[in-house]
């Protein structure tokens, strides 16, 4: 349920990754959306310190653009999801090994919290850039 508002990204973690002066969607299912989403990114970001140099920049871009989705121009604040193709590129090309490990850990219940699950998109549920080029964000 996309209830929220649009605002400039004022955080630090994703500043170098997001588009210049990005206007992002803040989800009001959190009491303090900016703080909650920044914490979500920060927690997941720390886990990325151990991944390969090939995977890390791709994973950081995916993570930031998934948690802080770009706002779609319009009269109702609407987040723009990442294009499926970019998500799959990270999952199957840049971070294939790491993604498998993460899915295995998730399956075996080895994560202490559910937080990281919120920061990882399900690629298959994302819109394809071939459906409507403006309906999803390209990394």
């Amino acid at each position: 349920d996309n209830k929220g508002y649009c605002a400039q990204y004022r955080g630090e973690v994703c500043n170098a990754v997001l588009a210049k002066d990005a206007l992002v969607f803040l989800n009001t299912s959190y009491a303090d959306p900016e703080e909650a989403q920044e914490l979500l990114v920060h927690t997941a970001w720390n886990e990325l310190k151990v991944v390969s140099p090939v995977c890390r920049p791709a994973a950081e871009a995916l993570l930031c653009n998934h948690i802080f989705q770009e706002c779609s121009p319009g009269v109702v604040p609407t987040p723009i999801p990442i294009c499926r193709e970019y998500c799959l590129a990270v999952k199957e090309l840049f971070c294939a090994k790491e993604w498998l490990v993460m899915e295995e850990k998730t399956h075996r219940g080895l994560y202490r919290s559910e937080m990281h699950l919120l920061s990882v998109p399900e690629c298959s549920k994302l819109p394809s850039m071939h459906w409507d080029p403006t309906a999803c964000a390209r990394l």
Partner: antibody, heavy 118, light 108 residues
């Protein structure tokens, strides 16, 4: 259609306060920050601050800190800007403005002329 | 605080090209927006995010931004383009929004 409609012109004496309203329609009021910008006669545009209509959070330009208060009433999709301790150099047109999903101000109110004169 | 400097005036003949500059420290790292304001009217956004145009704005209006200077270009200038033009950025460090000093475009 999308619009911001502001309250009418005001004439105030130095030291008084003024409260300008800005009624939004045609879009989700709580979805986008509302900004206030003023323009003195023959001068340029000056940003005063913003209010997040969702949370009520505000951020004011340093120049107006302590004199300006921005509030909102979400039930009637209206933002307010109150300026206190008015001086003659506060004589200006005051605009509300917002950006609908872009980082610029793409909708503006018609402006409210505030004249401060003894 | 962040400062944006514009030339006070630019004069251009009809059909020619007008270029309005907006100077600021490392402005290329920021998104620049441009507004047109005619006498007695509210400003109108003509270019946002350096070079994007809102719907309804003619293609004659274009923008660029790099280094310490952003530029609004109005090609094939018409009499109706005579107005004041302001650049604007968001200053991330202060979380304040800043307008340029404004440029009066006169069509000869």
């Amino acid at each position: 259609q999308v619009q911001l409609v502001q309250s009418g012109a005001e004439v105030k004496k130095p030291g008084a306060s003024v409260k300008v309203s800005c009624k939004a329609s045609g879009y989700t009021f709580t979805g986008y920050y509302m900004h206030w910008v003023r323009q003195a006669p023959g001068q340029g545009l000056e940003w005063m601050g913003w209010i997040n209509p969702n949370s009520g959070g505000t951020n004011y330009a340093q120049k107006f800190q302590g004199r300006v208060t921005m509030t909102r009433d979400t039930s009637i999709s209206t933002a307010y800007m109150e300026l206190t301790r008015l001086r003659s150099d506060d004589t200006a047109v005051y605009y509300c403005a917002s950006g609908l999903g872009i980082s610029a101000f793409d909708i503006w109110g018609q402006g409210t002329m505030v004249t401060v004169s003894s | 605080s962040y400062v944006l400097t514009q030339p006070p005036s630019v004069s251009v003949a009809p059909g020619q090209t007008a270029r309005i500059t907006c100077g600021g420290n490392n402005i290329g790292s920021k998104s620049v927006h441009w507004y047109q304001q005619k006498p007695g009217q509210a400003p109108v956004l003509v270019v946002y995010d350096d070079s994007d145009r809102p719907s309804g704005i003619p293609e004659r209006f274009s923008g660029s931004n790099s280094g310490n200077t952003a530029t609004l270009t109005i090609s094939r200038v018409e009499a109706g383009d005579e107005a004041d033009y302001y650049c604007q950025v968001w200053d991330r460090s202060s979380d304040h929004y800043v307008f340029g000093t404004g440029t009066k475009v006169t069509v000869l």
